[in-house]
């Protein structure tokens, strides 16, 4: 009965794969797939290159990268040849007005006068009360504080120069970075004139300076890296070895390890149930009920009512029950999963080069990101700079008649305005001309290009690895039948025949991701809107798109495996992969979860191991090491520890992603093998003896004088 039902289910997801006597693993005789998409992708890349060239021709990233004074003149060039650094009169106004978009579009522009200086101020200084009536010459020029805007007369009153923002009212010890003077040391600021009654700003400035400590910290960080880089590399080497070791040792310990992990999860859930029960009992005896609490948005309040703990107890109990039932009734599936993991470990051992393929992917991703970043930067600076009239305080007497934000010439500053602090400042880039008018569209094109190329590179990696691992599975006599250079041949084969299919899959994913980005942007814009219906709809949309992206990633991954094996187009491969998986849905879920659990534990082991070792080493807790192994003296010992941990995570993720791909590929091959073959002499199974044993199947032994037909 159950068998008949299963057959019906299988029928719904297509017929099992028929035996094909010519099939010997990844097909050799292939033709190009998804040619239209390939052409489209190549045209798009060509367009992307054209956009890059146009951006390069029209753009001037100096406008963003190099500092410019209030008049728009570059520091360190022309008239400011000897003044390479930019000083902001009030850098805190930059902090208050800067965001990532304005920086991307306009560079580091701030609503405060900016002047090119030969060197950054070294000492903290504020205009003293008694200096307001002095001359600019006495206060600034003779004291080597040449930080006023050009052309301020020597005998001008300081108070009027400050009112017009021609000179800075305070200076902070600064260090040049990106050609700009940034404050660094923890200065105790003297009373800041004019803003002393504005406590918030005064405290904010002092707090910022105290907390920044930027130069001291950056110097110390640099010193720490200089002293510990060698040991960080050692830690990363350890992470690399641990990851490899973990993957290679899986063939020996996969069974016991999975069992221990599952029992561990059961144990954690059991403890959770016990804890929830205890909390529930205590609160029940106290009579603490949700009815007494009423409705509240304070989530922590729910911890003190019995219903919360009862609900948690029920959820955990259900999970525990499900896991126990899975363990009892799906023993066979778990054993298959373990055997596949062992097989994957063997495959990686046979083809160690695959473990380092993520480096290729990383480099390609880096190229894509760098190209996009440069193009975006050049595009953002492709217009003529535009300048507008601006005053720091438009409510000052004399400013009411001034048309703020009207265009002006920066070389002809409004030095004689009745409006204090009126300046001609850089606003952005003009949108005159075809390129400038199309700027937004070109930037959108660039973003699309970024997503598509990134997804294509990731797809390429998956397909190449799938091709390599499939050639391992479909080698009847291992390792003799494995191709000599499985990874390189898979790489060439994929690039030559399946660029279009990968581009198709990547495009579908890109469109979903772009939709998600747009949705995130809309959500960000609607943050202030308190309409619960709108927020609920937005949340649903975001959730749906997140699920859709997850599903497409899963589908693409398996489609690429099918493409690697059979060389069919994307749609056919995706359909075949999907139907094959749906016919074996229980196996899929079990394998997926077991692999996830194992790889999570692997990452934990690698990162935790490196973290613990780094902690004990860098904090000097390991005694009795030889002179060569003495831990360096550090300002912040947590710095190399955190670097080692992050590096270890990246390395482990890279290795385990390869392993994950290997498991998925072998799993699909295994399912194909089960449907395609029957263990007879003509149709022997390609799977390992351990898998055959678990399934209770075996290959017919050929007579001694006969060799298996090839």
């Amino acid at each position: 009965m159950g068998g008949k039902q299963r057959d019906k289910d299988d029928e719904a997801y297509g017929k099992p794969v028929k035996y094909d006597p010519s099939f010997r693993g990844p097909i050799k005789n292939r033709s190009c797939t998804d040619v239209i998409c390939c052409v489209l992708f190549l045209l798009f890349i060509l367009g992307y290159i054209v956009v890059g060239i146009v951006a390069w021709l029209y753009g001037d990233p100096r406008q963003v990268l190099y500092p410019r004074n209030s008049t728009g003149a570059y520091c360190g060039m022309g008239e400011n040849k000897d003044k390479p650094y930019l000083l902001y009169f009030n850098i805190f106004s930059c902090i208050l007005s800067t965001n990532i978009i304005s920086v991307a579009e306009n560079g580091l522009q701030c609503p405060t006068p900016q002047v090119c200086v030969s060197s950054c101020p070294e000492d903290p200084w504020t205009v003293g009360k008694n200096q307001f009536s002095q001359t600019v010459g006495e206060v600034f020029y003779t004291k080597n504080r040449n930080f006023c805007l050009p052309g301020v007369p020597w005998n001008m009153m300081v108070i009027t120069s400050l009112q017009q923002e021609l000179c800075p009212s305070f200076l902070l010890p600064s260090a040049p970075a990106l050609g700009r003077c940034f404050p660094w040391t923890n200065v105790t600021l003297p009373e800041l004139p004019g803003i002393t009654n504005d406590t918030t700003i005064a405290q904010g400035i002092s707090g910022l300076i105290d907390s920044l400590n930027a130069r001291d910290i950056s110097v110390k960080i640099f010193e720490d890296f200089a002293h510990s880089w060698y040991w960080i590399l050692v830690a990363l080497g350890v992470a690399l070895l641990l990851s490899l070791l973990f993957i290679l040792l899986l063939r020996l310990v996969a069974g016991p390890l999975v069992l221990v992990l599952i029992l561990g999860v059961l144990g954690v859930l059991a403890y959770g149930i016990y804890y929830c029960w205890e909390e529930y009992r205590v609160l029940r005896d106290k009579g603490a009920s949700i009815s007494q609490l009423g409705f509240t948005t304070n989530l922590s309040a729910y911890q003190s009512v019995q219903e919360t703990w009862l609900a948690a107890l029920i959820v955990l109990a259900v999970l525990e029950a499900i896991l126990l039932l899975v363990l009892i009734f799906l023993r066979q599936r778990i054993r298959i999963a373990i055997a596949l993991l062992k097989e994957a470990s063997k495959a990686v051992g046979q083809m160690m080069s695959t473990m380092f393929y993520p480096l290729v992917t990383f480099v390609l991703l880096l190229i894509c990101i760098a190209y996009w970043a440069m193009t975006a930067l050049y595009l953002a600076t492709s217009g003529q700079p535009q300048y507008v009239l601006w005053a720091s305080n438009i409510s000052s007497p004399g400013c009411e008649k001034v048309s703020i934000n009207t265009s002006c010439n920066p070389m002809d500053q409004p030095v004689n305005s009745s409006c204090p602090g009126l300046m001609c400042v850089f606003q952005g880039y003009s949108s005159k001309g075809l390129v400038q008018r199309s700027l937004f569209n070109l930037q959108i094109y660039g973003v699309l290009g970024l997503f598509w190329t990134l997804n294509w590179v990731l797809a390429l990696g998956q397909c190449v690895l799938a091709g390599a691992f499939a050639s391992f599975y479909w080698a009847f006599h291992k390792p003799q039948d494995i191709p000599t250079f499985p990874l390189i041949s898979a790489f060439i084969r994929t690039l030559r025949y399946h660029t279009g299919s990968l581009a198709f899959g990547a495009l579908i994913l890109t469109l979903v991701q772009i939709a998600r980005v747009i949705l995130e942007y809309i959500d960000h814009k609607l943050r202030g809107v308190q309409n619960p219906v709108a927020r609920c709809i937005m949340c649903c949309f975001k959730c749906c798109l997140w699920c859709l992206e997850k599903f497409i990633k899963f589908l693409n991954r398996n489609a690429y495996i099918m493409i690697a094996i059979y060389g069919k187009n994307f749609c056919v491969s995706a359909k075949n992969a999907f139907t094959l998986l749906m016919r074996n849905i229980v196996r899929v879920v079990v394998l997926d979860k077991v692999t996830d659990l194992l790889l999570f534990f692997g990452k934990l082991l690698v990162v935790g191991g490196v973290g613990v070792l780094s902690f004990f080493f860098f904090s000097g807790r390991i005694q009795g090491l030889g002179r060569d192994f003495k831990s360096p003296h550090l300002n912040y010992y947590w710095l190399p520890i955190m670097t080692s941990i992050m590096g270890a995570y990246v390395i482990a993720s890279g290795f385990f992603s390869v392993f994950g791909m290997c498991v998925d590929t072998l799993f699909l091959c295994f399912l194909e093998d089960l449907e395609r073959n029957d263990g007879s002499l003509d149709r022997p199974y390609y799977m390992s003896k351990s898998l055959l044993k678990i399934l209770g199947k075996k290959n017919e032994a050929p007579p001694d004088n006969k060799k298996r037909k090839k």
């Epitope: 007369p153 005998n155 009153m157 004139p193 009745s418």
Partner: antibody, heavy 125, light 107 residues
Framework: QVQLVESGGGVVQPGRSLRLSCAAS????????MHWVRQAPGKGLEWVAV????????YYVDSVKGRFTISRDNSKNTLYLQMNSLRAEDTAVYYC??????????????????WGQGTTVTVSS | DIQMTQSPSSLSASVGDRVTITCRAS??????LAWFQQKPGKAPKSLIY???SLQSGVPSKFSGSGSGTVFTLTISSLQPEDFATYYC?????????FGPGTKVDFK
Amino acid sequence: QVQLVESGGGVVQPGRSLRLSCAASGFTFSSYGMHWVRQAPGKGLEWVAVIWYDGRNKYYVDSVKGRFTISRDNSKNTLYLQMNSLRAEDTAVYYCARDRYSGSDYYYYYGMDVWGQGTTVTVSS
Amino acid sequence: DIQMTQSPSSLSASVGDRVTITCRASQGIYNYLAWFQQKPGKAPKSLIYAASSLQSGVPSKFSGSGSGTVFTLTISSLQPEDFATYYCQQYTVYPFTFGPGTKVDFK
């Protein structure tokens, strides 16, 4: 109300000295800058010197630099102008004037507001 | 030093006339300009400061405008008590300097 009264003017021979005084009342003298302005007979106004509230910062017109000294005694609410090496061209009515800037304001400077009635200095042989 | 010039140096007007006096600075002085009124034998009196702000107690018929190098004092409707000499003064760069004055007398 705010009042400034000048004294000490008179007829003096060239090369001699004279000391003018300006008595202030009706405001906190020690908080304000004070100016001397002169007006030659039939001519326009000429700014001579300024002394700021704490007496530390003093500025003069070039024609009197090194000969005239502006000073103040905040305890007596009095402003002084010590004139040495007097010349015929120093003949004028000398006014003292209060500056609007009181040192407690920060970014606003608006110049002089209240003037005294003036004292006449005649330099003649 | 900043030179201040006034035009006209004198003008004759009748009661009720609208009178405009112009003051020019040899270099930009922003809005640091004051206007004073002086009657014969009397001390000068402050009318306008910061180029356009009216001194308290001064009637609103007096108004000032301009910035940078060109400034104007306007008396919207001349009254008998307004016949006097008017001086402009810059007070941003030492030494502070006055204009030569504009004498307003009866036509």
